[in-house]
């Protein structure tokens, strides 16, 4: 039940041992009580004891004191449990009876006689305090007290509030006197089922399943989950946001696995050879004469240095070598010639000059050729002139150094720090990436250098008709209307349905003219594209000669670092496919979409953990397909900007990045 009415019998006095009918009990009145508790009645009437009834065993003869007894027969106080909301009012009938029979169950005995009865009507609030009373009539006196208390787990003024203390998965609390929950230490929430995490545990990056715990969400670590975890493939780098790989000093490459100071750290070159921090392994050894091998670890034979000139063949001898000269040559190294200009000894277009009155000659070689007979092609890369891992390329009469990202100069000797010239306008934050600066713009600005002030949302004016969906375009003032079935036009303003009398002839002529016009435009574009297209080698050769402005328009794969979920990047450049491609498994930083930050949409969320992506709020485009590939259309290769579609970490959502 929800509560208990308790009645404590204290003393009964019947000095003369009389019954209610005036007769006396023989030998004395063996007294027991019947109690009936019912709803409040102004006039007590017979009928069921609606709130409960109880009988006692024989408690004494004539006059006696009733002792408290907690268990067994004759329990005192008497308990009348109820299973409803206590109304606050009641009627109580206490009857004293005499039994000639059984002491323990006298109510069932025949020949019982009423001694006296009392009736109490009134109000009674739930509480622990006993209300004491005494009732007298001409023959008897009864002293008693009573109260209403709530059963275990029931609380409140009417015992109607159930509260059972618990410490399990569903809650961790005790119950207040009014039935409200009192959370155990370390727990909070309406039902005390939310743990209070370790003090300082990061709100977004951390959570807990029990008090004073701080469990980190993917990508975060540490006691308070406020330190990021670098990318899985990262070798010598750190991070400022999860899965980043920012190289430690002296390391380079996408995963910071290229030692920019390999020579100093490892001294790989042997036998006095020269080490330079370049080449595919991060270093190159230039051997002294008489040594070879990747690390100049192998001693050469005496002939290894090719001492015989003019095609002479070398023979190793014990401590030296011997040159066997071809016809027309003599000397220790076959360096002297018996030929003259008359014998046309100069190869590869070399011109012959007579010397010593015609007894010998000298060849003047064209560019790219050398040797006494212009027989050798010049290799200008043998001296490893390119620093910092630059690649040397022979280019006709000269050579060029193709620098690794982050370096410039004729020999790649200069390190680029693009942020030094403060390229970001309007308080934008500059990030010095390997392939140039990237600006993170404050709210209200966009563009490569945060130079564009975002004026308004082009969709705010509701430009699309007939229930079409409006999407903001790639610049703040652009919009695109997605028309419902049956409507066309840039604003979906034209219905597709045909009118009853249709002017077929006029329409046919119109359509024909449009088709001709489209074909003409396609021919012009194709011709223009063919004229623009250059061979691969030529464009590669031009790489080092690009202006800074043009270089900024290139998107090297290594620059595309993503600190989130890595999806694929599609760039669609209209008809000119030569400058397009899909960059797969490369990663993109949020910062590559600076122009869109702070415009519409919700911050990215993990589904069950509120993992926020920070203050950056990218524009969202809905996509039907889970793989979500949206290609932004960009202009041909002579355009100023390339537009890029960045596939975000969320399922079914896209972010458009502009002006990379």
């Amino acid at each position: 039940g929800s509560g208990i009415f308790q009645l404590r019998l204290q003393e009964f006095v019947n000095q003369r041992g009389m019954l209610a009918n005036g007769q006396s009990c023989e030998p004395g009145c063996r007294t027991f009580f019947r109690i009936c508790l019912k709803h409040f009645q102004a006039t007590f009437s017979e009928g069921p004891c609606t709130f409960g009834n109880v009988s006692t065993p024989v408690l004494g003869t004539n006059s006696f004191v009733v002792r408290d007894k907690n268990s067994g027969s004759g329990r005192n106080p008497l308990q009348l449990p109820f299973n409803f909301t206590w109304p606050g009012t009641f009627s109580l009938n206490i009857q004293a009876w005499h039994t000639p029979g059984d002491d323990l169950r006298p109510e069932t005995s025949p020949g019982n006689s009423l001694i006296s009865q009392i009736i109490i009507q009134g109000s009674l609030a739930v509480g622990k305090i006993w209300r004491t009373d005494e009732q007298n009539d001409t023959l008897t006196r009864l002293s008693y007290s009573y109260r209403v208390i709530c059963s275990d787990n029931y609380y409140g003024e009417s015992c109607s509030r159930l509260c059972k203390k618990r410490d399990d998965h569903f809650g961790h609390y005790e119950c207040q006197p009014d039935g409200s929950l009192s959370c155990l230490p370390g727990w909070t929430g309406k039902y005390c089922d939310q743990p209070i995490c370790l003090s300082g545990c990061h709100e977004q990056n951390g959570y807990c399943s029990k008090p004073d715990e701080c469990i980190c969400r993917p990508g975060w670590q540490g006691r308070l989950c406020n330190e990021c975890i670098p990318h899985n493939g990262c070798r010598h780098g750190t991070c400022s946001i999860p899965w980043q790989c920012a190289c430690d000093e002296g390391w380079g490459g996408l995963f910071c696995d290229q030692d920019l100071n390999y020579c100093t750290h490892h001294s790989p070159c042997k036998n006095g050879s020269t080490c330079s921090n370049s080449g595919p392994k991060g270093y190159t050894c230039t051997c002294l004469p008489g040594y070879t091998g990747e690390h100049c670890e192998l001693g050469l034979s005496k002939c290894a240095s090719n001492p015989c000139r003019n095609g002479g063949s070398c023979k190793d001898q014990e401590n030296s070598y011997h040159c066997l000269c071809p016809p027309g040559y003599y000397g220790q190294h076959c360096e002297h010639s018996t030929l003259t200009c008359a014998d046309s000894p100069c190869f590869n277009g070399g011109s012959c000059r007579e010397r010593n009155q015609g007894s010998s000659y000298a060849c003047e070689c064209p560019p790219n050729f050398t040797g006494s007979n212009c027989e050798k092609k010049v290799d200008r890369c043998t001296s490893n002139p390119c620093a910092n891992g630059g690649q040397c390329q022979n280019r006709g009469p000269s050579r060029t150094c193709r620098c690794r990202p982050g370096f410039t100069g004729t020999h790649c000797e200069l390190h680029i720090s693009d942020c030094a010239r403060s390229p970001c306008a309007h308080g934008g934050t500059c990030h010095d990436l390997e392939n140039g600066p990237v600006c993170t713009c404050p709210a209200g600005f966009s563009g490569r250098r945060c130079e564009v002030r975002i004026t308004h949302d082009a969709c705010a004016s509701g430009p699309c008709f007939n229930g079409a969906t409006c999407y903001t375009g790639l610049s703040p003032n652009n919009f695109v209307c997605n028309c419902p079935y049956g409507f066309v036009g840039s604003r979906c303003e034209f219905p597709v349905g045909l009118p009853p009398s249709f002017p077929w002839v006029a329409v046919s002529l119109g359509v024909g003219l449009v088709v001709l016009l489209v074909l003409l435009v396609m021919v012009v574009v194709a011709v223009r594209q063919l004229r623009l297209r250059r061979p691969d080698d030529e464009s590669r050769e031009a790489m080092n000669n690009l202006s800074d402005f043009q270089k900024d328009n290139l998107i090297p794969a290594a620059q595309l670092k993503n600190t989130n979920q890595k999806k694929e990047l599609e760039v669609d450049c209209g008809l000119d496919k030569s400058n397009c491609g899909k960059l797969q498994n490369h990663t993109l930083d949020y910062n590559l979409a600076p122009g869109l930050l702070g415009r519409g949409g919700m911050p990215g969320k993990y589904p069950h953990s509120d993992k926020s992506l920070g203050e950056k709020v990218p524009l969202r485009l809905h996509s039907e397909k889970p793989e979500c590939r949206i290609s932004a259309i960009c202009s041909p290769r002579d355009s100023m900007y390339q537009s890029v579609c960045l596939i975000s970490e969320e399922r079914n959502e896209c972010v458009i990045a502009t002006e990379v």
Partner: antibody, heavy 118, light 107 residues
Framework: EVQLVESGGGLVQPGGSLRLSCAAS????????MAWVRQAPGKGLEWVAT????????YYRDSVKGRFTISRDNAKNSLYLQMNSLRAEDTAVYYC???????????WGQGTLVTVSS | DIQMTQSPSSLSASVGDRVTITCRAS??????LAWYQQKPGKSPKLLIF???DLADGVPSRFSGSGSGTDFTLTISSLQPEDFATYYC?????????FGQGTKLEIK
Amino acid sequence: EVQLVESGGGLVQPGGSLRLSCAASGFTFSNFPMAWVRQAPGKGLEWVATISSSDGTTYYRDSVKGRFTISRDNAKNSLYLQMNSLRAEDTAVYYCARGYYNSPFAYWGQGTLVTVSS
Amino acid sequence: DIQMTQSPSSLSASVGDRVTITCRASQDIYINLAWYQQKPGKSPKLLIFDTNDLADGVPSRFSGSGSGTDFTLTISSLQPEDFATYYCQQYDYVPPTFGQGTKLEIK
């Protein structure tokens, strides 16, 4: 090349102790969280413990809490697992791995066998 | 703990075959799932992380897909060196848990 080399495994009686070591090279050890993962003979993989790179915060699977202690020495590029009160069910090949409890394990050592038997 | 259930537990295939292994999580783990390859007597090797991202140096014939509770590892054209045991692992909840493994054998 990233290399993780475990040592310290062997035969030990139930209730005994063992200390496993892992020597790391080929990456900046102090920048990365580390873990121990074990594999009982003929069974699957089971994460044992993790330590963060930054402040040395540690986490353990319930069955080893209070018995195992993971630690690291960034100056020595080393990871350790102190195993006390060993039980028969701790018998496994113990792998040192680079990763946290909430990230994939990108690199693994060759493993060291711990046998708990009387 | 999150239970990871792989199916099948073993499978036989031939060189050149397209093979699919599935992994089911007992709760939503978003995309925080990795796949590993383990050859007898060797340590596991990370193949795929974040459900579909290839680890460094892993051939493109391996691919992953899925999200939430159901995930798939696909090998588009089996090579002789691909015969091994494959494990999935979730790292969305503590403790991180692995699947029981799928043994890929030569038919």
